[in-house]
């Protein structure tokens, strides 16, 4: 399939102009190569009419231009003074010959329609309302008023002042006068449908003294807006149907021959093919809404339509907006795993690609939720604190310059199964969707920490060991201390007299962490993990409680926070060993000014990131960089 895309079907009227936009993949070669517009000729040859090299055929002399917009990866062909001779089959394309990459375009130029004298032309979109104005003289002020539609030679009454309404206009047509006006009546026709188009005659009075007005009604199908998107990227359909449908259910559907199949609506319907990768977001009280689809697939290409109706389904005579989506398979977005599998108690490391040109952008990870129209609350981000319920088991590792960041989630439970999105505050195309599937564990985890009930005593030495299997022998082992802004790898042995140290006993495949001497702020979550370069692997977590050993009082163990991962995976509560009012950050709302569907990460200001009262009784250390 050619990666060039444009309008399949262009229609205009004699004497008018058209502007045709063609899209091409965003590459350096494409930006600079020749662009052309040619017409399908005899023997299948496509003869150039205009090109970016400066060629202009004599048929187009003085009436056409071709402009390249490399920053948008588009070029535009403008043709003026159209004649019916221009009706035909064309191609817009790229390359040194006209056999290269191209897109077929049909151009239809119609005759200027001929109407009787004094015909008022009304042009309205499908689903909208037209108000036809009918003037009359004072002599017909008390006479019968009517509107009829021309069908051949006959004129069939649509509505009249005796309250007759043609059945096909029932509940759609009204005839009325405004205020004290004595020389004009109006007919409103609402919920316009294509078959309403045609010539109407309004009349006041009968016989030769009747006043007549001609009105031509044109009912327009929505012109689809073209959207050119890369495979695996995302697309947003912005739908603005007007205030008159603000309170009706909204939908987005995909055209399928004669029907339009609903993908999502505000009544809770959602096509399973879009599960985990779609969000519908109301924009304001005027009926504006947007639909975001991530992880675009080849089969997502096609014609889409948004609309509003109380049923949440497409309905003839209701306003719609249309798009044609083209999915370019020559994508710059790398192919990444769409399904990641884990087991209860285990961990997953999810690699999130982002635009390498935007390494300083803020990175986020959110959990797609199916309720209502779909939403994606942020769980962790480079400047967003970890959401409640994920403390000690979720961290984001940025790898600047690599074009990817890694999100690690451990102490997995089956409730973690679902869809997650990787996103940044930069290039919105680089959103990826991952489905996490968590199955019940059938064997012991690869990494095991001893002792499992970890309580360290202030001032003493505390060692904790992480046992790993031989398959991890060649990988780098590490311990890190989890905090709300990541998991900071602990320094090696020689990096400070009082620092935590890491050493590895290769013979018994153990990596140990020693705290010497233990301080109150050492309390918290620690992770043992393996990695190869910047590729993170398995992790396991342990909560280290710190207490003061007081003489003469019995030693009371704090609640074992590690039970959450081991014995009671579903349990969310942690008692005195972790402060319950852990600070969280609000995402800057400007990051997602057009993407309110991604929920903010917390309920407190970003400035409160570092935890206060470090070292207070029962408080968690606010260890931050």
């Amino acid at each position: 399939q050619s990666p060039i895309f444009g309008p399949q079907d262009v229609s205009s009227i004699e004497g008018n102009s058209v502007s045709i936009t063609c899209y091409y993949p965003d590459t350096s070669v494409n930006r600079h190569t020749r662009k052309y517009w040619c017409r399908q000729g005899a023997n299948g040859y496509c003869a150039t009419l205009i090109s970016s090299n400066g060629y202009l055929s004599k048929e187009y002399s003085g009436r056409a231009s071709l402009i390249n917009f490399p920053e948008n990866s588009t070029f535009v062909i403008n043709i003026a003074h159209l004649t019916q001779e221009d009706t035909g089959s064309y191609k817009c394309g790229l390359g040194t010959t006209n056999r290269g990459l191209f897109f077929d375009v049909s151009l239809e130029v119609s005759q200027v329609p001929e109407f009787p004298n004094d015909t008022h032309v009304y042009t309205k979109d499908i689903g909208r309302t037209v108000t036809i104005e009918c003037r009359f003289k004072e002599g017909n002020a008390h006479s019968k008023k009517s509107l009829c539609k021309k069908r051949g030679e006959a004129c069939e009454v649509v509505i009249d002042s005796t309250e007759y309404v043609d059945p096909s206009y029932k509940d759609r047509a009204i005839l009325f006068m405004k205020g004290t006006s004595r020389d004009i009546f109006y007919v409103n026709i609402s919920h316009l449908i294509p078959s309403d188009a045609g010539l109407y005659v309004c009349q006041a009075g009968e016989g030769p003294s009747a006043d007549k007005n001609n009105a031509d009604l044109q009912v327009l199908e929505p012109e689809p807006e073209l959207l050119y998107k890369d495979l695996r990227s995302s697309v947003t359909f912005e739908c603005d149907l007007g205030r008159e449908v603000a309170n009706d259910a909204k939908y987005l559907c995909r055209k399928n021959k004669e029907t339009c199949d609903v993908i999502i609506n505000t009544l809770g319907k959602r096509d399973p093919a879009f599960e985990g990768r779609i969000l519908l977001t109301p924009r304001d009280d005027n009926g504006r809404f947007s639909v975001l689809i991530t992880g675009l697939r080849k089969e997502d290409a096609g014609h889409y339509q948004c609309g509003a109706h109380s049923s949440g389904l497409p309905q003839e005579g209701w306003p719609v907006q249309a798009w044609q989506l083209f999915v370019n398979e020559e994508s710059t977005i790398p192919n990444s795993r769409s399904v990641v599998k884990g087991v209860t108690g285990g961990s997953v490391a999810i690699v999130c690609p982002y635009n390498p040109k935007e390494s300083s952008s803020l990175k986020y990870w959110c959990h797609w939720e199916a309720d209502e129209n779909g939403r994606c609350p942020v769980l962790v981000g480079t400047q967003a604190l970890v959401q409640e319920g994920y403390e000690g088991r979720l961290a984001l590792f940025d790898q600047p310059g690599s074009g990817a960041y890694t999100v690690i989630l451990n102490q997995l439970t089956t409730q973690d199964s679902g869809f997650y999105w990787c996103l940044t505050d930069g290039d919105s195309r680089w959103r990826t969707t991952i489905e996490l599937q968590v199955a019940e564990a059938t064997k012991k985890p690869d990494l095991e920490v001893t002792p499992q009930n970890a309580t360290a005593v202030i001032g003493e030495t505390f060692t904790i060991s992480c046992h790993y299997p031989c398959k991890f022998y060649s990988q780098e082992k590490y311990w890190c201390k989890w905090s709300n802004d990541g998991c900071h790898i602990l320094p090696s042995h020689d990096e400070g007299a009082r620092q935590s140290s890491v050493s590895c006993d290769q013979s018994s495949q153990i990596v140990s962490m020693t705290l010497n001497p233990v301080k109150k702020e050492d309390e918290g979550w620690y992770w043992c993990g393996v990695k190869e370069g910047q590729v993170y692997g398995e992790t396991t977590a342990i909560y280290v409680a710190v207490e003061e050993r007081t003489r003469g009082s019995p030693h009371i163990n704090p609640t074992d926070a590690n039970a959450r991962a081991k014995d009671a995976p579903e349990e969310e509560a942690m008692e005195s060993s972790v402060r319950e009012d852990e600070n969280k950050a609000n995402l800057d709302p400007r990051l997602f000014a057009d993407e309110r569907e991604i929920q903010n990460a917390g309920d407190q200001a970003q400035e409160n990131r570092a935890s206060g009262n470090a070292g207070s009784a029962g408080g968690q250390s606010g260890s931050s960089k």
Epitope: G44, S89, D104, S106
Partner: nanobody, 119 residues
């Protein structure tokens, strides 16, 4: 040179159906657009339907939803399926093929086939 041969005209009742066919021969490979026009009593020749080389079809408002234009894989034969016929559809139907020579548009016409719709 393009030759167009029409078939399928005849008499039909109002509400009934007919199918017209048009086969192109000669330099048919260069056909740009193919379709049908009609001449009804007392009127000039008017556009009915056409199909472009990218399979886009256009119809006159008066036949939209009732007539369907299709063509064969080799693109040399077009068929006009006419349903829900009305007396107003009575007339001579002409097949049209348009070729663009590289500098000018040439329209080729069939001989015409009579369609009569009785009420």
């Amino acid at each position: 040179q393009v030759q167009l041969v029409e078939s399928g005209g005849g008499l039909a009742q109002a509400g009934g159906s007919l199918t017209l066919s048009c086969a192109a021969s000669g330099t048919a490979a260069g056909i740009d657009v193919m379709g049908w026009y009609r001449q009804t009593p007392g009127n000039s020749r008017e556009f009915v339907a056409r199909i472009f080389s990218n399979d886009v079809t256009h119809y006159a408002d008066s036949v939209t939803g009732r007539f369907t234009l299709s063509r064969t894989q080799d693109k040399n034969t077009v068929s006009l399926q006419m349903n829900s016929l009305k007396p107003d559809d009575t007339g001579v139907y002409y097949c049209n093929a348009r070729i663009w020579t590289g500098s000018t548009t040439v329209d080729y016409w069939g001989q015409g086939t009579q369609v009569t719709v009785s009420s």
